[in-house]
């Protein structure tokens, strides 16, 4: 299969900026390339086909170029409606592979997260599982690292993260990380902590609780 690689994966920009997204094919696809725009919860919208042909109704600020293996999508002057995720797709071969996407986000100012930790509810413990939640509120940029420690032992493979879409008012993100354990495992340990690293923090922030003392 022909693989498609997009860069960057995220692009932070302001209204009026000129932005360029690159798509590379693992082998020549001539000009059999399409570009799509997608917004959360919406179907993809075709912007460009045959590498540089503008789909009907698409504003002329969208410019496609390239052939062979290297392609670009340029937005000449970014508008508020253009903050979205962009995908390239080859259709030289029947497999019609997509790139992994480039998210064009609003460039914000660095903001440190507010961090909170929540123990499992008694109600949940009755069901035999325990979820500990670490909540990071209103931070920018999106990159944040959450590490779980149980009795100071680093946990891996038993947590899941969920990040909100960028807030339209202040350009920040929020994130929740959920550590899931069986009730039996949860009750074997005392100190539960989440450690957060972010560009807006001069050093990592740790929030913790002692089981049974909440």
């Amino acid at each position: 299969d022909i693989q498609m690689t997009q860069s960057p994966s995220t692009l932070s920009a302001s209204v009026g900026d000129r932005v360029t997204i690159t798509c590379r094919a693992s082998q020549s696809i001539n000009t059999w390339l399409a570009w799509y725009q997608q917004k959360p919860g919406k179907a993809p919208k075709l912007l460009m086909y045959k590498a540089s042909s503008l789909e009907s109704g698409v504003p002329s600020r969208f410019i496609g170029s390239g052939s062979g293996t290297e392609f670009t999508l340029t937005i000449s002057s970014l508008q508020p409606d253009d903050f979205a995720t962009y995908y390239c797709q080859q259709y030289n071969s029947d497999s019609k592979m997509f790139g992994q996407g480039t998210k064009v986000e609003v460039k914000g100012t660095v903001a440190a997260p507010s961090v909170f930790i929540f123990p499992p509810s008694d109600e949940q413990l009755k069901s035999g599982t325990a979820s500990v939640v670490c909540l990071l509120n209103n931070f920018y940029p999106r990159e944040a690292k959450v590490q779980w420690k149980v009795d100071n032992a680093l946990q891996s493979g038993n947590s899941q993260e969920s990040v909100t879409e960028q807030d339209s008012k202040d350009s920040t993100y929020s994130l929740s990380s959920t550590l899931t354990l069986s009730k039996a495992d949860y009750e074997k340990h005392k100190v539960y902590a989440c450690e957060v690293t972010h560009q807006g923090l001069s050093s990592p922030v740790t929030k913790s609780f002692n089981r049974g003392e909440c």
């Epitope: 993809p44 086909y49 045959k50 259709y91």
Partner: nanobody
Framework: QVQLQESGGGLVQAGGSLRLSCAAS????????LSWFRQAPGKEREFVAV????????FYSDSAQGRFTVSRDDAKNTVYLQMNSLKPDDTAVYYC??????????????WGQGTQVTVSS
């Protein structure tokens, strides 16, 4: 305005079957190829199968070949994806899309919102 609406997704055990439907409105599909794609969390959207214009057959991805069958009912303006011998790896949101012109362009001007397929082991 062209609209595509997928249905038929759900939770199924490994080895089971599902039949997805994609109903089109606003465009007569008989002159167009319709394709199925899927997207698993954190992965690229990938091609599954295409139902070319009636009489022109179908094409499948390697992962769908032999297990999935795409068909179309132009009178009902609907395309189907019959999925058999499902595996946990088939868990994804499944989308249908219609070609942007009558000559298998391979670019798609309209997409459905998707239907979730979850295969449990």
């Amino acid at each position: 305005q062209v609209q595509l609406q997928e249905s038929g997704g759900g939770l199924v055990q490994a080895g089971g079957s599902l039949r997805l439907s994609c109903a089109a409105s606003g465009r007569t599909i008989s002159r167009y190829a319709l394709s199925w794609f899927r997207q698993a969390p954190g992965k690229e959207r990938e091609f599954v199968a295409v139902a070319r214009r009636s009489g022109d057959g179908a094409f499948y991805s390697d992962s769908a070949q032999g297990r999935f069958t795409v068909s179309r009912d132009d009178a009902k303006n609907t395309v189907y994806l019959q999925m058999n011998s499902l595996k946990p790896d088939d868990t994804a949101v499944y989308y249908c899309a219609i070609d942007s012109d009558t000559f298998y362009s391979g670019s798609y001007d309209y997409w459905g919102q998707g239907t979730q397929v979850t295969v449990s082991s």
